[in-house]
Interface confidence: low
Amino acid sequence: SEVGNSQAVCPGTLNGLSVTGDAENQYQTLYKLYERCEVVMGNLEIVLTGHNADLSFLQWIREVTGYVLVAMNEFSTLPLPNLRVVRGTQVYDGKFAIFVMLNYNTNSSHALRQLRLTQLTEILSGGVYIEKNDKLCHMDTIDWRDIVRDRDAEIVVKDNGRSCPPCHEVCKGRCWGPGSEDCQTLTKTICAPQCNGRCFGRAPNECCHEECAGGCTGPLQTHCFACRHFNDSGACVPLCPQPLIYNKLTFQLEPNPDTKYQYGSVCVRSCPHNFVVDQSSCVRACPSNKMEVEKNGLKMCEPCAGLCPKACEGTGAGSHYQTVDSSNIDSFVNCTKILGNLDFLITGLEGDPWRNISALDPEKLNVFRTVREITGYLNIQSWPKHMHNFSVFSNLETIGGRSLYNRGFSLLIMKNDNVTSLGLRSLREVSAGRVYITENRRLCYLHTVQWAALSRRRADLDIRNNKPRGKCQQEGKVCDPLCSADGCWGPGPAQCLSCRHYSRRGVCVESCSFTQGETREFAEGTECFECHPECERVEGGITCNGSGADTCTRCAHYRDGPHCVERCPEGILGERGPIYKYPDSSRECRPCHENCTRGCTGPLLQDCLGDALPSARRAPTVI
């Protein structure tokens, strides 16, 4: 049968040889997994299945995306008469797409005698290992090189059945069994040299389309037995219709209304309900650097800005821990939000012999650099002697004050004699509760902070017995001149609450690099941003007026419409197929002749690189 589109898909397994329970239990598991299944998305693992197992339910399987493992079974026949392709996206034992071993029972005649894989004509990746199957016949009569695509793949077929009947004479020595219906179908080794893949006959014009897997009935991509890459409504294609296509009018990639997603080797309009979209694929879960979001009813993976959000339980009332200490510090790795509070008490920092808790390694406090929000309070009553600020909280933006410490405090810093500045450079809001900062004898800069600007209500401050303001000024412990009158959290231009002039990635600067410097910038408000890398640096002048590649004064390489680009479009997907352009003498991207299929050096048909389509083959494309 040729390539269809609606397929019963089932998940494979990744158990290897590990099984639980007896053979009957194993059979029930197999039955539930594979009954009526056509495409196994993963591995087909058949291990420790008994001699009386009726495996006829496997007969519908046409494709396995991973590997096929058949080991330590006692049934006589493995009925996979429709299995066309094993993709080998996962391999067993590091290199095998088919692994068949030890399928016999030493104490009886129960053993695997036939692998009826009469339609198997393609293993896309990985090799074959068939060994120590006492009664398994005809494995050495198969031309495995015809099936395996990878020339370097390892093929091991040995120590299997010894007294086996010969192939039927019509099979010319190549068969899966003794009958005339068991002949191996050859689709590669018999092909004319002109065929770079498989064929449906020996003649030079009987080559399969290069997107076919396993063979075909004719030359078109709709004639394939199976697809090498993806099946799009019955046609084998190298890629499913992509989410973005090049718009020749706007010179930009824009959403493709006909986009489809890769679900195994099939292109689907929407992913199954328990899958999410990651770029152009259906996946079970987002990778670790992305988070799941819902857009327009579509669940998709969105790259996280920095670390992905991770909420962690805090300390204090309602929590398992009284203080941050060596027993719990590792639970805060990669946390961006603390649900509750953070308490730093002397028993946490120096250890608690009564509870058998050792002293905390101060270096480990750096785990808090990822924290952006604390929903409760922050209470610091003990801090390592050599650490002179709380810069491990330099990314903390919000203290919620949903739970408060003692007499209603959301920020409490007391009796930290070694601390000279707070260093809370990102803190923008103390939503509720009082601020209590007392008896930190060396602490400066805190008098400069406009606390009222941080509080949603009128700031209730209790700030006393720290280093006197006058002494701090005498010692030069004042805000950097680049800071505004809003104050600062510590010394230097990176500790300002806001900037007098401009800021670059959180550091106050005199000016942006508008007309000089290695990297040129533009300003949005008072923030400096780098020009797009495709903008050419203009000596003594403005390089760009925005962040986009369409805001450059001049282009570093080429210009495609309003956009500066590293190279002109080469085979980029457009509405009607790939788009090719070439750069003219003024480095503007111009369209190649409509019949060029591999790019060009100029606008004419004779400027095409490689083969051009005959004029009648391609519809005219208006640029």
Epitope: P255, K295, M300, S547, G548
Partner: nanobody, 121 residues
Framework: EVQLVESGGGLVQPGGSLRLSCSAS????????MGWYRQTPGKERELVAG??????????RYADSAKGRFTISGDYAKNTVYLQMNSLKPEDTGVYYC????????????WGQGTQVTVSS
């Protein structure tokens, strides 16, 4: 499910002004294009003004009929787009729809329900 809500439409005399605004009911991550479209009876819906952004700086595009009279602006943080319409003419009459898009891999597209603008004396 994100929904877009337009407001600011109504009846105005020729030469008058209106400011349309459109807000998203939920947060749209990675929003990088917003626009206003007009539908008049018997005609296709057409772009009036659009604003695209790669990060923060907007690059705008206007229909010929809107140039010099209409100004589009967007607040990406608030997921809101505005259309300031001055020197209105009777031919500006129609239903105005806003659109917000994520024009990148795995993108999404959202449309509002429309707000009626009528320019008549």
């Amino acid at each position: 499910e994100v929904q877009l809500v337009e407001s600011g439409g109504g009846l105005v005399q020729p030469g008058g002004s209106l400011r349309l605004s459109c807000s998203a009911s939920g947060s749209i991550f990675g929003l990088n294009a917003m626009g206003w479209y007009r539908q008049t009876p018997g005609k296709e819906r057409e772009l009036v003004a659009g604003i695209t952004s790669i990060t923060r700086v907007g690059s705008t595009r206007y229909a010929d009929s809107a140039k010099g009279r209409f100004t589009i602006s967007g607040d990406y943080a608030k997921n809101t787009v505005y259309l300031q319409m001055n020197s209105l003419k009777p031919e500006d009459t129609g239903v105005y729809y806003c659109r917000m898009s994520i024009v990148k891999s795995g993108g999404a597209d959202y449309w509002g329900q429309g707000t009626q603008v009528t320019v008549s004396s």
